[in-house]
Interface confidence: low
């Protein structure tokens, strides 16, 4: 008799793929535009990335550092109207993209929470949650919660409102903290909160250190669903050396939890790489005309258009990974086991019941290495085969689909491999 299938876990929509942050509409859409109506025209692009949620804004009226002139219920007219927002929601819904609204109050100001009037601002947030839930948003994000006095209790209250409306709604909190204890204490009082932090960016970017960070985080947070990012708002390029971008994309998409990216991460957009741009919101490079101020400043391989046409680009890798992440059971909700491998490497397995299994091997080092996979660390349910098929490499030159002998596996500098192998009873 065939073994009984393991019961599938309850899957919320944010468990099924990546979230994509657009913190600045104008910068995302490029010069001369930057409103909700224009964003609607970019939804096909987001669909092509296979992201499951769009974290948008803030969009509300906010006069810098002025509580009285901050209205969380009103869209800043520069971004568009309620009708534009509603049209965006409807269009996103048709494309199965959920919209999460950032309600961080004083987003144009110094202290995002108006340090002197936290209580009145928190009440404003509470009222705004109900309003926007009725308007049809799928969730909320609030950032810089370390600057919010008594953050845990506020978050608990806001999560109750959000989940009270529907279990299918999501609350995301962001913090600049990288301290695990602080992160865990914020998570403890909120069972379904997604927390983005600087935890992973506090790294020496070696295989050993990254493995240790990931395993400590998973151990500390227990069975709860995690999110993975390098910061609450910034670009990957602000935290990573360029040669590790591909490696981190592979890792973020294959760790157990929800990967969270910022617009431009998929093309390796750099903060303020071009003259005159604000560091926190560089202009998205759609094509070579995206930065008209200085002719020739943008080359094709920096842009969405150029990278879309190149199967070896970072954008193509992102799309491949996002596709795998959204359809493979083992990557969607599979068990996670790390095991020993060569120095500078971080290796792990994702498996779910009798579904295809995935092996991830990441070489953080500057030299080519033998993988040295030691499966003795693994439980019997997750044993390694002798061969596995290559799904993708972060580096060019390997043939996708080719079987690789695991004992003889060698990795190029900064190479990451995603391999698949079948369940064997």
């Amino acid at each position: 008799r065939a073994p009984r299938c393991r019961e599938l876990p309850a899957q919320k929509w944010w468990h099924t793929g990546a979230l994509y942050r657009i913190g600045d509409l104008q910068a995302f859409q490029g010069h001369g535009s930057g409103n909700l109506a224009g964003l609607k025209g970019r939804l096909d692009y987001l669909s092509s990335l296979k992201v499951k949620g769009l974290v948008l804004g803030p969009l509300h009226k906010n006069q810098k550092d002025d509580v009285a002139q901050t209205d969380l219920l009103q869209i800043d007219p520069n971004f568009g109207s309620k009708e534009d927002f509603d049209n965006l929601l409807q269009s996103a819904k048709k494309k199965s993209i959920r919209v999460i609204l950032d309600l961080t109050p004083n987003y144009r100001g110094e202290n995002l929470w108006f340090s002197t009037q936290v209580d009145s601002v928190a009440t404003k947030v509470k009222d705004a949650l109900e309003f926007w839930l009725q308007a049809g948003v799928d969730g909320f994000q609030v950032r810089d919660i370390e600057n919010l006095k008594d953050a845990s209790s506020f978050l608990a209250e806001w999560e109750n409102i959000t989940k009270g409306f529907s279990e299918d709604r999501l609350l995301i909190a962001g913090t600049n903290s990288s301290d695990l204890q602080q992160i865990v204490s914020l998570l403890e009082s909120n069972k379904d909160l997604l927390l983005t932090s600087s935890y992973l960016s506090d790294s020496s970017f070696t295989g050993e250190h990254t493995k240790s960070l990931v395993t400590q985080y998973l151990n500390a947070t227990g069975n709860r669903w995690c999110s993975w990012s390098l910061s609450q708002a910034g670009l990957l390029t602000s935290f990573l050396p360029a040669q590790l971008l591909r490696l981190y994309q592979l890792m973020l998409f294959t760790l157990p939890g929800t990967p969270v990216f910022s617009y431009g991460d998929e093309i390796g957009l750099k903060a303020a790489a071009l003259p005159g741009q604000p560091v926190e919101a560089p202009v998205m490079l759609w094509d070579e005309s995206s930065f008209p101020d200085i002719p020739g400043a943008v080359s094709a391989n920096m842009t969405v258009k150029g990278q879309s046409e190149d199967p070896g680009s970072l954008l193509s890798l992102f799309r491949q990974l996002s596709d795998q992440r959204s359809k493979e059971r083992s990557l969607l909700h599979g068990d996670f086991h790390t095991f020993s491998s060569g120095p500078g490497l971080f290796s792990y397995i994702r498996h779910w019941d009798q579904n295809e299994r995935f092996l991830v091997v990441l070489n953080f080092g500057d030299v080519g290495l033998s993988a040295g996979l030691q499966a003795s660390d693994l439980p019997a349910s997750a044993s390694l085969p002798t061969k596995a098929d290559l799904v993708l490499s972060t580096q060019p030159g390997r043939e996708e689909g080719s079987p690789l002998e695991l004992e003889r596996l060698k990795l190029e500098p900064h190479e990451g491999l995603l391999l698949r192998f079948p369940y064997v009873a």
Epitope: D86, N87, Q90, S91, K93, K94, K95, S96, S166, D168
Partner: antibody, heavy 121, light 110 residues
């Protein structure tokens, strides 16, 4: 194979409430993000969309009928129902239940065979 | 919400091609690619022929095709056959999260 079957009285008196039930077989009404809909067709005329109930329980109605329509879901019986209040002879029609979805698959792929409801005293 | 506008009738001889138009507004046909077409024989339930403007469900003949330009969608039937004689309805999802149908077109095969 999903099948839908309408049931309810074929004759309703004016000013009363028309009540119809659609029984779904071959699939659970609460699994998958489907739009369980009611559509009607006046004799010799075109189709008119009445409203739908989403698997989550959200309802949307034709604005011209909104004040008189209620659509509800009974997951235990795998049924959804239509109530149309204060009926007049103008509500005489063949009533169809239909399914659209899941999620953004916004077309009606399964239909009941239709049931004729006559409003007359 | 106003019904989508279709011609009341069209006709054609066997083997010919005919086109049925369906005109809506910026809130429905123009705004979304969620136009579907249904065939209905007398006394029967409607049957889905085209979805998402131009896609055919499995089992539907390639003689049926759909297209859209602006706020007008079209259904074309090529190589007309006697059994194609029926009523045809277009439908669109709208920006109010509702559906709207066309008034229907009676196709006569001469």
């Amino acid at each position: 194979q999903v099948q839908l079957q309408e049931s309810g009285p074929g004759l309703v008196k004016p000013s009363q409430t028309l009540s119809l039930t659609c029984t779904v077989s071959g699939g659970s009404i609460s699994s998958g993000a489907y739009y369980w809909s009611w559509i009607r067709q006046h004799p010799g005329k075109g189709l008119e969309w009445i409203g739908y109930i989403y698997y989550s329980g959200s309802t949307y109605y034709n604005p011209s009928l909104k004040s008189r329509v209620t659509i509800s879901l009974d997951t235990s019986k795998n049924q959804f129902s239509l109530k149309l209040s204060s009926v007049t002879a103008a509500d005489t029609a063949v009533y169809y239940c239909a399914r659209a979805g899941p999620k953004w698959e916004l077309w009606f792929d399964y239909w009941g065979q239709g049931t004729l409801v006559t409003v007359s005293s | 919400q106003s019904a989508l506008t279709q011609p009341a009738s069209v006709s054609g001889s066997p083997g010919q091609s005919i086109t049925i138009s369906c005109t809506g507004t910026s809130s429905d046909v123009d705004n979304y690619n969620y136009v579907s077409w249904y065939l209905q024989h007398p006394g029967k339930a409607p049957k889905l022929m085209i979805y998402d403007v131009s896609n055919r469900p499995s089992g539907i003949s390639t003689r049926f095709s759909g297209s859209k330009s602006g706020n007008t969608a079209s259904l074309t039937i090529s190589g007309l056959q006697a059994e194609d004689e029926a009523d045809y309805y277009c439908s669109s999802f709208t920006s109010s999260s509702t559906w709207v149908f066309g008034g229907g077109t009676k196709l006569t095969v001469l």
